[in-house]
């Protein structure tokens, strides 16, 4: 008799793929543009990335550091009108893209939550949640919550409002903190909160360090759903050298939880390469004409257009990983087991019941390495086969689809491998 299938977990929409943050509409769309109507025209691009949600804004009226002149119910006219927003929502829904609205109040000011009048601001947020839920948004984001006094209790209250409206609505909180204890204390009182933090931001050094950060986090958070990013708002290139971008894309898409990216992460957008551009929101490079200020700074392979035409580009890798992440059971909600693979390496298995299983091996080092996969670290339910098929490598040159002997696995510097193998009873 065939073994019984394991019961599928309840899956919310944010469990099924990546979220894509557009914090600065003008930078995302390019100079001379930057409104909601223009963003609507970019939804096809977001669809091509297979992202499940768009984290938008803030776009509300905010006069720097002035509580009275901050209105969370009003869209700043520079970004468009309520009608433009409604139209964007409708178009996004048709493309199965959910819209999450950032309501961080004083986004133009020094302290995102103002330095005084905490209760006034919290009331404004509460009113805004109710207003925008009625308007049809799928969730909310609030950032810099380390600047919000009594953040845990406010988040719990806002979570109640959001979930009270519908279980299908999401609340994301962002913090600059990278301290696990601080992160856990925020999560403790908020069961379904998705928290983005700087927890992984210093993980770029070694595979062992990254492995310990990831496993500590997963052990500490138990069976609750996580999100994975390197910060609450900034680009991957703010933290990582170019040679690690592919490795991190592979890792973020294959860890158990929701990967969260900022616009431009998919092409390796790097403010440092664009003189004068702000680190937190450089102009998006759609094509070579996107940065006319200093044309020599931009080459085709830095742009969406150039990378779309190159199957070996970072953008092409992002699209492939996003696609896999949204359709494979083992990646959607599979169990996770990390195990030893040798110095400089981080490796883990994702598996769900009798579905196809995935092995991820990441070489963070700048030398080629032979992987010594320690299968003895794994439970019987997640045992390794002798061979696995190469689904993709972060480096060009490998023959995809070919079976690789796991005992003889060699990785190039900064290479990540995604391998698949079938369930074996």
């Amino acid at each position: 008799r065939a073994p019984r299938c394991r019961e599928l977990p309840a899956q919310k929409w944010w469990h099924t793929g990546a979220l894509y943050r557009i914090g600065d509409l003008q930078a995302f769309q390019g100079h001379g543009a930057g409104n909601l109507a223009g963003l609507k025209g970019r939804l096809d691009y977001l669809s091509s990335l297979k992202v499940k949600g768009l984290v938008l804004g803030p776009i509300h009226k905010n006069q720097k550091d002035d509580v009275a002149q901050t209105d969370l119910l009003q869209i700043d006219p520079n970004f468009g009108s309520k009608e433009d927003f409604d139209s964007l929502l409708q178009s996004a829904k048709k493309k199965s893209i959910r819209v999450i609205l950032d309501l961080t109040p004083n986004y133009r000011g020094e302290n995102s939550w103002f330095s005084t009048q905490v209760d006034t601001v919290a009331t404004k947020v509460k009113d805004a949640l109710e207003f925008w839920l009625q308007a049809g948004v799928d969730g909310f984001q609030v950032r810099d919550i380390e600047n919000l006094k009594d953040a845990s209790s406010f988040l719990a209250e806002w979570q109640n409002i959001t979930k009270g409206f519908s279980e299908d609505r999401l609340l994301i909180a962002g913090t600059n903190s990278s301290d696990l204890q601080q992160i856990l204390s925020l999560l403790e009182s908020n069961k379904d909160l998705l928290l983005t933090s700087s927890y992984l931001s210093d993980s770029g050094s070694t595979g062992e360090h990254t492995k310990s950060l990831v496993t500590q986090y997963l052990n500490a958070t138990g069976n609750r759903w996580c999100s994975w990013s390197l910060s609450q708002a900034r680009l991957l290139t703010s933290f990582l050298p170019a040679q690690l971008l592919r490795l991190y894309q592979l890792m973020l898409f294959t860890l158990p939880g929701t990967p969260v990216f900022s616009y431009g992460d998919e092409i390796g957008l790097d403010a440092a390469a664009l003189p004068g551009q702000p680190m937190e929101a450089p102009v998006m490079l759609w094509d070579e004409s996107s940065f006319p200020d200093i044309p020599g700074a931009v080459s085709a392979n830095m742009t969406v257009k150039g990378q779309s035409e190159d199957p070996g580009s970072l953008l092409s890798l992002f699209r492939r990983l996003s696609d896999q992440r949204s359709k494979e059971r083992s990646l959607l909600h599979g169990d996770f087991h990390a195990f030893s693979a040798g110095p400089g390496l981080f490796s883990y298995i994702r598996h769900w019941d009798q579905n196809e299983r995935f092995l991820v091996v990441l070489n963070f080092g700048d030398v080629g390495l032979s992987a010594g996969l320690q299968a003895s670290d794994l439970p019987a339910s997640a045992s390794l086969p002798a061979k696995a098929d190469l689904l993709l490598s972060t480096q060009p040159g490998r023959e995809e689809g070919s079976p690789l002997e796991l005992e003889r696995l060699k990785l190039e510097p900064h290479e990540g491998l995604l391998l698949r193998f079938p369930y074996a009873a």
Partner: antibody
């Protein structure tokens, strides 16, 4: 009218650092990139780098990377250029110069107009 | 880096005569997307900072006399004085702002 006023001449010993200031007036300070250009005695002009006063992001010429730091103080509309580990060949007049045309706080075309009056930095033991 | 060269190093011209200075870039500074040449010309008199004369290779800065004109495209550019005046004695520099590091030509000294 638009004006850039620089700090006075400096004499420094090799190995020391110098910090030159440039105070802007007559326009919205955060709306234009500021550049630093130097000119050794009897020589041509050499671009050192730029700062975007809006967010403080910088871009330096490779030659000065690691030795130069550009900062700004928006409350006084002043930019600063600090050059460390000075050597005799750093003796020059240092100019601040504003980007010629900006469409937004993050988008500028980089011809230089106007220029500060210049600050002579002499490095001598 | 884009290298800028100028010729001649110096020139002496009679008052009222026409004069030209040439500037060459080691790679094109013409940006096809907007069809603009990222090149500027400056005048520097002794003891003074440089003064902008021309940007976009041929657009005269306001207040600059119309005897100054700029032309050229791609890699080859010219600054022309239609009728040299005594106050035009100075060193003239071209500059590219197409890519960083922004670079200047070595300068051309103009005398009467």
């Amino acid at each position: 009218q638009v004006q850039l006023v620089q700090s006075g001449a400096e004499v420094k010993k090799p190995g020391a650092s110098v910090k030159v200031s440039c105070k802007a007036s007559g326009y919205t300070f955060t709306s234009y990139y500021m550049h630093w250009v130097r000119q050794a005695p009897g020589q041509g002009l050499e671009w050192m780098g730029l700062i975007n006063p809006s967010g403080g992001s910088t871009s330096y010429a490779q030659k000065f990377q690691g030795r130069v730091t550009m900062t700004r103080d928006t409350s006084t509309s002043t930019v600063y250029m600090e050059l460390s580990s000075l050597r005799s060949e750093d003796t020059a007049v240092y100019y601040c110069a504003r980007a010629g045309y900006c469409r937004s706080t993050t988008s500028c075309f980089n011809w230089f107009d106007p220029w500060g009056q210049g600050t002579l930095v002499t490095v001598s033991s | 880096d884009i290298v800028m060269t100028q010729s001649p190093d110096s020139l002496a011209v009679s008052l009222g005569e026409r004069a030209t200075i040439n500037c060459k870039s080691s790679q094109s500074v013409l940006y096809n997307s907007n069809n603009k040449n990222y090149l500027a010309w400056y005048q520097q008199k002794p003891g003074q900072p440089p003064k902008l004369l021309i940007y976009w290779a041929s657009t005269r800065e306001s207040g600059v006399p119309d005897r100054f004109s700029g032309s050229g495209s791609g890699t080859d550019f010219t600054l022309t004085f239609s009728s040299l005046q005594a106050e035009d004695v100075a060193v003239y520099y071209c500059q590219q702002y197409y890519s960083t590091p922004f670079t200047f030509g070595p300068g051309t000294k103009v005398d009467i």
